[in-house]
Interface confidence: low
């Protein structure tokens, strides 16, 4: 069947369209195109005779049409009037006619649209805005874009006038956006330039910053005000209701208490005509003076004086605080605070009370600290120490003794030999000593401030021969498996070798034995009863040697588990029972007996004459060592059989 296809169907003005013929019959004479849906000679566009290949224009020919041998018709430079139906009339060789109709539509190329607005400066929450997409074009579709997105769903947005008009009711600041409109028809689409909606709003309630409301006298007050507003707000400041200035910031240097009050920021929008205010209350506090500490005694004497520290100045209704060594006050019966905390009293000062001490005045905002104060506690002198500790010297060496005593102020020192004053120095030096330099060497330390003096006496022996040494012990009665014992070989002598013997033998190798202090001290750790031996120390130098008398270590031990003898446990009725208890112990233990749990006698031997079966039972021996504080016991069962019964068998067997 003969058909016409329009390519394209929708044609833009100025473009071209091809009316393409399909299923054209064979053996044709010719064909003719007509404008409209029927063959009408008045509306013939063009005719074509195949035999002559001659095209003949008709009344409707415009000069823009071209006919092709295959009967297709090309129309160029299309105009709006070309819209409609076109009919092809085919004349076959047998002069039988055939017709087919096609159509196309012509649309204009759309111009770039623009947006008109009925209100260029709408006011928030008050005005509506109507945007209209220009120009009005027939057969065009209108679309809208907000920030390049399609329109959101909102009851405040309304499309009308065939979508050509977009109305925003009750505009808000959030409606400030980029708006575009778009026109579309089947042959073109065009978008407008952006229109930015300028919504007037505010001012909102202003915010005053910083949020600080409390200031100290002498600080700078710098307040800034901001309110959301379009156009930007104009600002005014009021203090206690009095106008100050029309600026966004308020600056007052070096404020005083008089600057306390209510500070109001007023924001004004000239376009909306609205005003909003915010009030902040500023409090300026007087800066209290820096506190300082006074003392009733600048040089207290240890263990004699009390010291009262007072925090100045005195201010009514003020809290006073104290610190010692950067810590809050320790709980101590020697520290007393007055009712108002302003005075801290140290009863009976010690050298450890030097401080530093700080007091603080608490004001409304913080705590002001005083400078630290250190107490000059006078103390001492303590007992002087003479060094070195040697007491024996060989002739010909130099004697150099030094004296020191803890003291504030530092002690003044004097040396005496055999009671005779020598010199007022801390050190005593005698070169090339002889036996005549032997004697009592006294160091005297004197504190001029407290008036106190202390002395220490040291015996110095100058001899070529070493003295007979002796052994001192730090524990005369050590307890086994508990105590350690340190033996020291006396005296301490210069350039001397110290040696030790146990039971006449040199020291055994043992982890429990340790030599120290130049071999002068022998320590026995965790003593045992086997350490109860004779200990001898010896000293020697290049010209002599000597040994101490032996010292026997008295190790306290026990009591060990006691043994009851004889070992028999079966007796015949009528025999005598004579039990003896023994336990290894130093010192000897105390003994006691119990029969069937009942206390008997405090003896080592238990004797019962002519026993009977009534004496059957448990016999317990208890031992106690009062020196070690330890106890022990053992239990023995005794069975007494009737006469004539074999021991160990029950009656009637």
């Amino acid at each position: 069947k003969l058909t016409i296809e329009s390519t394209p169907f929708n044609v833009a003005e100025g473009k071209e369209v091809l009316l393409l013929v399909h299923n054209l019959p064979q053996h044709l004479f010719g064909y003719s195109w007509y404008k409209g849906e029927r063959v009408d000679g008045n509306r013939q566009i063009i005719g074509y005779v195949i035999g002559t290949q001659q095209a003949t224009p008709g009344p409707a020919y415009s000069g823009r049409e071209i006919i092709y041998p295959n009967a297709s018709l090309l129309i160029q430079n299309i105009i709006q009037n070309d819209t409609g139906f076109y009919t092809l009339h085919v004349i076959k060789s047998d002069l039988v006619n055939e017709e087919a109709t096609g159509q196309f539509r012509v649309y204009p190329e759309l111009p770039k649209p623009s947006i008109s607005s009925n209100n260029s400066k709408p006011v928030e929450d008050k005005d509506a805005v109507a945007f209209t997409c220009e120009p009005e074009t027939q057969d065009a579709t209108y679309l809208w874009w907000v920030n390049n997105q399609s329109l959101p769903v909102s009851p405040r947005l309304q499309l009308s006038n065939g979508n050509r008009t977009l109305t925003l009711f009750n505009v808000t600041r959030n409606d400030t956006a980029s708006y575009k409109c778009e026109t579309q028809n089947p042959v073109s689409a065009r978008r407008s330039d952006s229109v930015i909606l300028n919504v007037l709003y505010g001012p909102d309630a202003p915010t005053i910053s910083p949020l600080n409301t409390s200031y100290r006298s002498g600080e700078n007050l710098n307040l800034s005000c901001h309110a959301a507003s379009n156009p930007p707000a104009q600002y005014s400041w009021f203090v206690n209701g009095t106008f100050q200035q029309s600026t966004q910031e308020l600056f007052i240097p070096n404020i005083t208490v008089n600057n306390s009050g209510s500070y109001t920021c007023q924001a004004h929008n000239s376009d909306t005509g609205l005003n909003r205010t915010t009030v902040t209350t500023i409090t300026v506090y007087a800066e209290p003076p820096k506190p300082f500490i006074t003392s009733n005694n600048s040089n207290p004497v240890e263990d004699e004086d009390a010291v009262a520290l007072t925090c100045e100045p005195e201010i009514q209704n003020t809290t006073y605080l104290w610190w010692v060594n950067n810590q809050s006050l320790p709980v101590s019966p020697r520290l007393q605070l007055s009712n108002d905390n302003r005075t801290l009293t140290l009863l009976s000062v010690t050298r450890n009370d030097v401080g530093p001490y700080e007091c603080g005045i608490q004001n409304e905002l913080s705590v002001d600290h005083s400078d630290p104060v250190i107490l000059n506690v006078l103390y001492g002198p303590d007992d002087p120490t003479i060094s070195p500790s040697y007491t024996y010297y060989r002739p010909g060496v130099n004697l150099s003794l030094s004296c020191h005593a803890a003291s504030n102020p530092p002690a003044q020192y004097s040396w005496l030999i055999d009671g005779n004053i020598q010199q007022h120095t801390q050190e005593l030096f005698i070169s090339n000593i002889t036996e005549k330099n032997s004697g009592l060497y006294t160091c005297q330390a004197n504190n001029s401030a407290s008036g106190h003096s202390r002395t220490t006496v040291k015996t110095i022996t100058v001899s070529a021969e070493l003295p007979k040494p002796s052994i001192s012990s730090n524990n005369s009665k050590p307890v086994e498996d508990k105590d350690a014992v340190a033996f020291t070989c006396e005296p301490e002598a210069q350039n001397t070798t110290y040696l030790w013997w146990v039971n006449g033998q040199s020291l055994p190798v043992s982890p429990r034995l340790q030599l120290s202090n130049g071999n002068r001290t022998l320590t026995l750790f965790n003593v045992t009863r086997n350490d109860a031996r004779a200990y001898v120390c010896g000293i020697q130098n290049s010209v002599s040697a000597n040994r101490s008398d032996p010292v026997t270590l008295d190790v306290l031990y026990g009591p060990d588990t006691p043994i009851i003898s004889p070992p028999d446990s079966s007796y015949l009725s009528g025999a005598n029972l004579n039990l003896s208890c023994h336990s290894a112990s130093n010192p000897s233990p105390q003994y006691s007996w119990r029969i069937n749990g009942i206390p008997q006698q405090h003896t080592q031997v238990l004797f019962i004459a002519k026993i009977t079966p009534n004496n059957n039972g448990t016999y317990a021996c208890f031992v106690s060592n009062l020196a070690t504080g330890r106890n022990n016991s053992i239990v023995k069962s005794i069975t007494v059989s009737a006469s004539g019964t074999s021991p160990g068998l029950s009656a009637g067997a």
Partner: nanobody, 119 residues
Framework: EVQLVESGGGLVQPGGSLRLSCAAS????????IGWVRRAPGKEEELVAA????????RYADSVKGRFTISADTSKNTAYLQMNSLRAEDTAVYYC????????????WGQGTTVTVSS
């Protein structure tokens, strides 16, 4: 320059816990009082807790007593607010501020941290 920086806010379910921190610089917190102030839309500003480290004093708003604990670590110059058994009405922006002990007035403020209590 005095600065207070809060942290530790967030979203928590009712009954949950949060611990807010306030790091101070430019001054010693042992010499002043530090408070936690909260602001919620439509509610009055509320001082929920304050601590004066130099005298060991703490105080709490009735609405948080027994649930919130304020503390201070003077060695770290930091104050803390431990918030337990949180409720929806505790939702607010929490600010750390220096507090005048005798008056509920604030001198220096942090920028705030948001606490949201919601299931």
């Amino acid at each position: 320059e005095v600065q207070l920086v809060e942290s530790g806010g967030g979203l928590v379910q009712p009954g949950g816990s949060l611990r807010l921190s306030c790091a101070a610089s430019g001054f010693n917190i042992k010499d002043t009082c530090i408070g936690w102030v909260r602001r919620a839309p439509g509610k009055e500003e509320e001082l929920v807790a304050a601590i004066c480290p130099y005298i060991g004093e703490t105080r709490y708003a009735d609405s948080v007593k027994g649930r919130f604990t304020i503390s201070a670590d003077t060695s770290k110059n930091t104050a803390y607010l431990q918030m337990n058994s949180l409720r929806a009405e505790d939702t607010a922006v929490y600010y750390c501020a220096t507090v005048a002990r005798k008056y509920n007035q604030y001198n220096y403020w942090g920028q705030g941290t948001t606490v949201t209590v919601s299931s």
